[in-house]
């Protein structure tokens, strides 16, 4: 009786189980009753990353400098090239097909996490006691100035966008 399912790393074809090709190789011809699956290595610019029965290897990704991309890791016969973005840019998707500039955190927001080649800047609102008066991709929220430590008093309260304004204490005579 012909099999209806095959073991791992095998596939069913012509009522029999054939071995899949190992990573880095493509299928040339299916096995027969008398012959093994025939596989061929991928060429230098190609890869296959799994046990497979693909008839063509896939081209390594091209990291297009015109899209702000650069090679992070060169591809092998078993892995694709991994692209990342140039300084100041990050990928628009997991497969990193193009890059966009890091966003800046607006006044009232500080940088929670600085952007990388694969992730954008993460901003957070400045909590009470902190402020940011600049649009920046690097600056965290800064604490309000402590007037007391300077022997001064608060003349104007701080906000999430402005520091407190300190002034001299009124002298009682």
């Amino acid at each position: 009786e012909p099999p209806t399912a095959c073991r791992e790393k095998q596939y069913l074809i012509n009522s029999q189980c054939c071995s899949l090709c190992q990573p880095g190789q493509k299928l040339v011809s299916d096995c027969t009753e008398f012959t093994e699956t025939e596989c061929l290595p991928c060429s230098e610019s190609e890869f296959l990353d799994t046990w497979n029965r693909e008839t063509r290897c896939h081209q390594h990704k091209y990291c297009d400098p015109n899209l702000g991309l650069q090679v992070q890791q060169k591809g092998t016969s078993e892995t694709d090239t991994i692209c990342t973005c140039e300084e100041g840019l990050h990928c628009t998707s997991e497969s990193c097909e193009s890059c966009v500039p890091h966003r800046s955190c607006l006044p009232g927001f500080g940088v929670k996490q600085i952007a990388t080649g694969v992730s954008d800047t993460i901003c957070e609102p400045c909590p009470v006691g902190f402020f940011s008066n600049v649009s920046s991709a690097f600056e965290k929220c800064r604490p309000w100035t402590s007037c007391e430590t300077k022997d001064l008093v608060v003349q104007q309260a701080g906000t999430n966008k402005t520091d407190v304004v300190c002034g001299p204490q009124d002298r009682q005579r």
């Epitope: 899949l20 990353d49 799994t50 008839t55 896939h58 497969s95 097909e97």
Partner: antibody
Framework: QVQLVQSGGGLVQPGGSLRLSCAAS????????MSWVRQAPGKGLEWVST????????YYTDSVKGRFTTSRDNPKNTLFLQMSSLRAEDTAVYYC?????????????WGQGTLVTVSS | EIVLTQSPATLSLSPGERATLSCRAS??????LAWYQQKPGQAPRLLIY???NRATGIPARFSGSGSGTDFTLTISSLEPEDFAVYYC?????????FGQGTKVEIK
């Protein structure tokens, strides 16, 4: 049993954007190559895009390169097609499709399809 | 890319008759050819892969043959549910391509 359930189609103006989703169940999603195939009204089938199981490697037909992005969320068993700078000629029913074991094609399971209409 | 040409464009037959659909490739696709069936308003369904292997759940009246550039899908005795459009598709070369389809209609 294997199921591919699509969502996200609709009417969009030329130059606009749309995101299609395909929720997979009944198989180990991350082990399979997934693709998008489209069919213009009254026309034949056209391969659009493919993404390998890892999600790192993607491929596109020339007419959508730079405009469409295929991605996948393996923990959530979901495939996506982000379409931007849409043109009238992108009007079609879009299908997500699963490759057979070990290969990109043929496609042994298909979503129900979702209509994308690009018109002003 | 490999171009697949299907013939005839339309096949008018009666239930119980034998249907023979042709798919010709612009260059050899070895044995890496599949056939799909599509009914109005439905997604395609895989019938045959690697020229002659029936997909899961496909009745024995569907069979495929051929190699290289010339392939045939045969439906030995048409059932009412077989009236549909049939597409061939190759995976020998990149990108994967489909034929333009053959419509099998009731005579």
């Amino acid at each position: 049993q294997v199921q591919l359930v699509q969502s996200g189609g609709g009417l969009v103006q030329p130059g606009g954007s749309l995101r299609l989703s395909c929720a997979a169940s009944g198989f180990t999603f991350s082990n399979y190559v997934m693709s998008w195939v489209r069919q213009a009204p009254g026309k034949g089938l056209e391969w659009v895009s493919t993404i390998r199981g890892s999600g790192i490697s993607t491929y596109y037909t020339d007419s959508v390169k730079g405009r469409f992005t295929t991605s996948r969320d393996n923990p959530k068993n979901t495939l996506f097609l982000q379409m931007s700078s849409l043109r009238a000629e992108d009007t079609a029913v879009y299908y997500c499709a699963k490759g057979i074991v070990g290969a990109t094609t043929p496609f042994d399971y298909w979503g129900q399809g979702t209509l994308v209409t690009v018109s002003s | 890319e490999i171009v697949l040409t299907q013939s005839p464009a339309t096949l008018s037959l009666s239930p119980g008759e034998r249907a023979t659909l042709s798919c010709r490739a612009s260059q050899s696709v070895r044995s890496f050819l599949a056939w799909y069936q599509q009914k109005p308003g439905q997604a395609p369904r895989l019938l045959i892969y690697e020229t002659s292997n029936r997909a899961t759940g496909i009745p024995a009246r569907f069979s495929g043959s051929g190699s290289g550039t010339d392939f045939t899908l045969t439906i030995s005795s048409l059932e009412p549910e077989d009236f549909a459009v049939y597409y061939c598709q190759q995976r020998s070369d990149w990108p994967p391509t489909f034929g333009q389809g053959t419509k099998v209609e009731i005579k």
